[in-house]
Interface confidence: medium
């Protein structure tokens, strides 16, 4: 039975050219996290964090994506095209798969606030 829940940074905004942290957290389960996949809105993989084999940033993103903090992901040099949904997929043993959603809005305005509150989607 899957008892866990994914908490995410929810809907966040950041300014063009800046950076943002995408963060998910799995709670309420003792399941072992084997792997976390980070995907973009078009389902392309940004990065993978395997518990034993380590981080892998996909080539298309290696100049703009930094691993961490923790199981999260840092997007740098943001462009307007980065606006959209991001998904964290937790592959766990023995529970199975958990999936969280984050919506990132990249703003032109220099007064854009970067909110980083945790919320359950």
């Amino acid at each position: 039975m899957m008892t866990g829940t994914i908490e995410t940074t929810g809907n966040i905004s950041a300014k063009k050219g800046g950076s943002v942290i995408l963060q998910c957290h799995l709670s309420s389960t003792m399941a072992q996290v084997t792997q976390v996949n980070w995907e973009q809105h078009d389902h392309s993989l940004l990065a993978i964090r395997n518990a034993e084999l380590g981080w892998h940033i996909y080539p298309a993103f290696k100049d703009r994506v930094a691993p961490g903090p923790g199981l999260g992901l840092t997007l740098q040099s943001l462009t307007m095209n980065d606006t959209g949904e991001y998904f964290c997929t937790y592959h766990t043993y023995p529970d199975g798969t958990y999936r969280g959603r984050i919506f990132l809005e990249v703003l032109e305005s220099s007064v854009a606030e970067h909110s980083a509150r945790f919320q359950i989607p």
Epitope: L45, N50, E52, T89, H91
Partner: antibody, heavy 127, light 107 residues
């Protein structure tokens, strides 16, 4: 720190039996698949057998099928390889290894890579 | 059984040079391919998994590429500790198989 220590190797006559053990520590043994890989003197690596984390499924190389049996005792954190009807060509260093799981989100299946290895135990089959 | 053929059998190079090792599969293994390094008297060490991903702690000078039947391990600039035997392995299906190995030796 993951540690795997093989034992039980030695010199044995053709046709006889031998049981190898692999004592595991530093990880939750019951959560991981385990494998045996061997290497004949001066030769390359040869996969011998695999066993799932709970012992429910076992897989063997054709060269040892029907003669070797892989098993595990999760309460003792130990992997075994029972080798019967030994032949000269079974002479090798036998390594146990622990798999690390990687989920392929394209083919939607897990792959198992051999990340942690013991130092090996030498089995010599000779009359 | 999937047969993996490695070439060349021996590669003689000097420290600082680039090493390119090849592994060819008799049928497609998708990206289910690993590369291991083995030094004399030691157990193998996992370098690359899923054809192109570096395992934890592996230096960036090691890189893997390819999919299907043709794979390459590249060492961008050989360090003294890189002279060893390298094996490819497919984990696409049973029986799991290794290539015959490529020995990278000092020229």
């Amino acid at each position: 720190e993951v540690q795997l220590v093989e034992s039980g190797g030695g010199v044995v006559q053709p046709g006889r039996s031998l049981r190898l053990s692999c004592a595991a520590s530093g990880f939750t043994f019951e959560s991981y698949g385990m494998v045996w890989v061997r290497q004949a003197p001066g030769k390359g690596l040869e996969w011998v057998a695999s066993i799932l984390y709970d012992g429910s499924n076992r897989y063997y190389a054709d060269s040892v099928k029907g003669r070797f049996t892989v098993s595990r005792d999760n309460s003792k954190n130990t992997l075994y390889l029972q080798m019967n009807s030994l032949r000269a060509e079974d002479t090798a260093v036998y390594y146990c290894a622990r798999v690390s799981y990687y989920y392929d989100s394209v083919e939607l299946r897990w792959a198992e890579y051999f990340q942690h290895w013991g130092q090996g135990t030498l089995v010599t089959v000779s009359s | 059984e999937i047969v993996l053929t490695q070439s060349p059998a021996t590669l003689s190079l000097s420290p600082g040079e680039r090493a390119t090792l090849s592994c060819r599969a008799s049928q497609s293994v998708s990206s289910y391919l690993a590369w291991y390094q083995q030094k004399p008297g030691q157990a193998p060490r996992l370098l690359i998994y899923d054809a192109s991903k570096r395992a934890t702690g592996i230096p960036a000078r090691f890189s893997g590429s390819g999919s299907g039947t043709d794979f390459t391990l590249t060492i961008s600039s050989l360090e003294p500790e890189d002279f060893a035997v390298y094996y490819c392995q497919q984990v696409h299906n049973f029986p799991l198989t290794f290539g015959g190995g490529t020995k990278v030796e000092i020229k």
